[in-house]
Amino acid sequence: QNLFTKDVTVIEGEVATISCQVNKSDDSVIQLLNPNRQTIYFRDFRPLKDSRFQLLNFSSSELKVSLTNVSISDEGRYFCQLYTDPPQESYTTITVLVPPRNLMIDIQRDTAVEGEEIEVNCTAMASKPATTIRWFKGNTELKGKSEVEEWSDMYTVTSQLMLKVHKEDDGVPVICQVEHPAVTGNLQTQRYLEVQYKPQVHIQMTYPLQGLTREGDALELTCEAIGKPQPVMVTWVRVDDEMPQHAVLSGPNLFINNLNKTDNGTYRCEASNIVGKAHSDYMLYVYDPPTTIPPPTTTTTTTTTTTTTILTIITDSRAGEEGSIRAVDH
């Protein structure tokens, strides 16, 4: 056997090159046949009407032909025939790769509530061979379940991802990524998750800045409530008591002027949205006003030591020297 060919793999729409090579040439007629055994080239002449076949080289040692705009129907065995005595035949297999025509991501619900499990589907249509689908939530790879449907030598792959959503997932992309031999680089499609979650409530003491509340001082607390949808109602209540008469409520802010010991207690900020409600508590303890030290009567040199005390709002409810905030979700 001195007739040689090589198999060819080509992407649909591109160019395949078929080469029939003769090692020891004796000027015998060489021809190239298609999978239906129709003659494409007889020596350097193309009797076949398909003008996508073009002669690249013809010599006593090679018949080289290009096939442009390859389609899936071109796939199969192409025969090189050499009319020696006895005749020789060799075949080359053209394999046509078809990238997925369409990549669609479909999310069960546009908006999900935290804690829910949602179904996300990704479909890669009409590829050959079947496409591999990978899932990512942000940068984290997730495992989906794929189903392959074959039709007319083409494959449609649908991958299903069951995803339990958390509030941190809001705005995070769910990415369907395709791996296919006919696709170079990244072919992907994505949808951004929209996750609704109940409010997270935080109380911030905006006055006094140093955090120590004394009689006669003013107190200002700001309630920050973040949720999706954004809470429409933010309310202040005093736990187990009436709100002081001199307390002023202005949206998320609570002002109490001229603090006195009767203002001691737990102040609660409550926020709600369609998902649920939550609150955070602030325990107010009003300290005695500072005592004034009389000026010295003798002329002496004194060294003043300034002690800076950093006060921290803590998140438990122990009775201490400063007010404390406790956040509670309901």
Partner: antibody, heavy 116, light 109 residues
Framework: EVQLVESGGGLVKPGGSLRLSCAAS????????MSWVRQAPGKGLEWVSA????????YYADSVKGRFTISRDNSKNTLYLQMNSLRAEDTALYYC?????????WGRGTLVTVSS | SSELTQDPAVSVALGQTVRITCQGD??????ASWYQQKPGQAPVLVIY???NRLSGIPDRFSGSSSGNTASLTITGAQAEDEADYYC???????????FGGGTKLTVLG
Amino acid sequence: EVQLVESGGGLVKPGGSLRLSCAASGFTFSSYAMSWVRQAPGKGLEWVSAISGSGGSTYYADSVKGRFTISRDNSKNTLYLQMNSLRAEDTALYYCARDNWYFDLWGRGTLVTVSS
Amino acid sequence: SSELTQDPAVSVALGQTVRITCQGDSLRSYYASWYQQKPGQAPVLVIYGKNNRLSGIPDRFSGSSSGNTASLTITGAQAEDEADYYCNSRDSSGNHVVFGGGTKLTVLG
């Protein structure tokens, strides 16, 4: 000069045999497939048989299969057609032609008459 | 076996254009070749492939193909074009040659 010259035709009785020859000159004979084409008096062209350049592959029309044998001697640049069991309907002018898929060179023909 | 069908006879006025057609299933895949044969002479290849003329053939001869029909067109027919015209192709295997029945072209005037 590039040419083909047929010979060997004549009058033969039904059931008889005849061997036609075609001498080629002016081109590399072994590089080309060759065919025999015949034409009955007042009729159209009919392909009879073909042979590859090396002689390794042969093809026949259904009407002559089993009765005719095509061969070649590349050292003599000669094509042959051995015709056995001849019938009246084999009466025709027999042309040899260079087969490039299309027939780009023809001889003048040799007449075969099958008659009792 | 494959068959090629031609009109038995066609006539054309001198200097006019004439088209000779050839029909057959094999022509869906393969180009036809066209041969001119004058009385008492061997056939001569006129057109082969998509529209290739053998050297020495006037450019008034051209070939075309559509579907299962091949056509030979003579643009500005001359008296010397009067002859029998045969189309030929191969069967689908490419191993068996088939000829049309031939068309007798008469040039009038």
